[in-house]
Interface confidence: low
């Protein structure tokens, strides 16, 4: 399964949409988990409502919200107030009993303006990756996040 790279700005929201076959996954709950290392286990962050018919209701765990449109076959995860610590590899999963089928692997990158005083010199421009069918990203338009200037030598 390919990994989709999604980018969001620190302090903003990042919306991830994972699409799936609505018939194949009929009756299954969905989950969003964070992968611990390349081959490590996937730690559950949040899952959809325990009653499948209520999966459209938003479920929240901390700053992460999940909702499932079971007719359209789209589960949406929103990471609010993105922080550096939110960066990493995640999975959208479809749950069947104790088994989980991976719908999409997502690498979350958190961007911000260059440098802060504690972290002199730590900058990066990520490689662009073409988003493909199965996951997409929306950036919120809030622009009130203030970022400190880099130090000047």
């Amino acid at each position: 399964l390919n990994t989709t790279v999604l980018q969001g700005m620190a302090g903003q929201s990042l919306r991830v949409s994972c699409t799936y076959d609505a018939l194949k996954h009929w009756g299954r709950r969905k989950a969003w988990c964070r992968q611990l290392g390349e081959e490590g286990p996937c730690q559950r962050v949040v899952s959809t409502h325990g009653v499948w018919l209520l999966a459209f209701l938003k479920k929240r765990n901390g700053s992460t919200v999940i909702a499932d449109d079971t007719l359209a076959g789209t589960v949406t995860i929103t990471l609010k107030n993105l922080q550096a610590g939110d960066a990493g590899l995640y999975q959208c999963q479809s749950l069947r009993g104790r088994e989980a089928e991976v719908l999409q692997k997502v690498l979350v990158e958190v961007l911000e303006d260059p440098l802060d005083d504690q972290d002199a010199g730590d900058l990066w421009v990520p490689e662009e990756s073409s988003s493909f069918e199965g996951a997409q990203v929306e950036h919120s338009t809030s622009r009130n996040q203030e970022t400190s200037f880099p130090p000047t030598s």
């Epitope: 900058l123 421009v125 990520p126």
Partner: antibody
Framework: QVQLVQSGAEVKKPGASVKVSCKAS????????ISWVRQAPGQGLEWMGW????????NYAQKLQGRVTMTTDTSTSTAYMELRSLRSDDTAVYYC???????????????????WGQGTLVTVSS | EIVLTQSPATLSLSPGERATLSCRAS??????LAWYQQKPGQAPRLLIY???KRATGIPARFSGSGSGTDFTLTISSLEPEDFAVYYC?????????FGGGTKVEIK
């Protein structure tokens, strides 16, 4: 694909101003900064400054402070560099480049100026 | 500001030979150093970032090494298209300075 397209060549008289544009496409403009770099004929590269397309923060090279202004128009994904009180030694090719911007992912963070615009020749001559 | 000194200013080599370019910083820049290639009439092209990481699409014959104040760009076997000017740039502190460049020319 990610692309930066700059405005055309300009000929200016000493004391005048020039405004060079840099139109971005292929990426989320407000997620990145834009740097401006110039190169006088036969010379090396000189970093002029940087602007965040996200919140408008700027950082200018000290020698250009007071003469240069960098702005962005997020509605058109365009960055602008205006240089005032032009002198003959401002004759150069002016480049815009995406970056730098910090990113966190997994284990590390790095920097690049990539891509670059095609360059805009500004000639200052009386 | 951080001053980057590149040496040699000119390197005369033949295709197939190994090129070793040096960049020295006036103070530590950790690994926050990039290398660019520029051909006449063209914009610079990113080769290496974070001192040793090859940018997308850059051939394996280009490699970067070093950290702190001393950095090296190595072209293991020069191809005809590699003859150009190479610049290093520190991205540790504003202002983000460039070295003076090394011209790699055909012998």
């Amino acid at each position: 694909q990610v692309q930066l397209v700059q405005s055309g060549a300009e000929v200016k008289k000493p004391g005048a101003s020039v405004k060079v544009s840099c139109k971005a496409s292929g990426y989320t403009f407000t997620n990145y900064g834009i740097s401006w770099v110039r190169q006088a004929p036969g010379q090396g590269l000189e970093w002029m400054g940087w602007i965040s397309a996200y919140n408008g923060n700027t950082n200018y090279a000290q020698k250009l402070q007071g003469r240069v202004t960098m702005t962005t128009d997020t509605s058109t994904s365009t960055a602008y560099m205006e240089l005032r009180s032009l002198r003959s030694d401002d004759t150069a090719v002016y480049y815009c480049a995406r970056g730098p911007t910090k990113a966190y992912y997994g284990s590390g963070s790095y920097v690049v100026f990539d891509p670059w615009g095609q360059g805009t020749l500004v000639t200052v001559s009386s | 500001e951080i001053v980057l000194t590149q040496s040699p200013a000119t390197l005369s080599l033949s295709p197939g030979e190994r090129a070793t370019l040096s960049c020295r910083a006036s103070q530590s820049v950790s690994s926050y150093l990039a290398w660019y290639q520029q051909k006449p009439g063209q914009a610079p092209r990113l080769l290496i970032y974070d001192a040793s990481k090859r940018a997308t699409g850059i051939p394996a014959r280009f490699s970067g090494s070093g950290s702190g104040t001393d950095f090296t760009l190595t072209i293991s076997s020069l191809e005809p298209e590699d003859f150009a000017v190479y610049y290093c740039q520190q991205v540790s502190l504003f202002p983000l300075t460039f070295g003076g460049g090394t011209k790699v020319e055909i012998k």
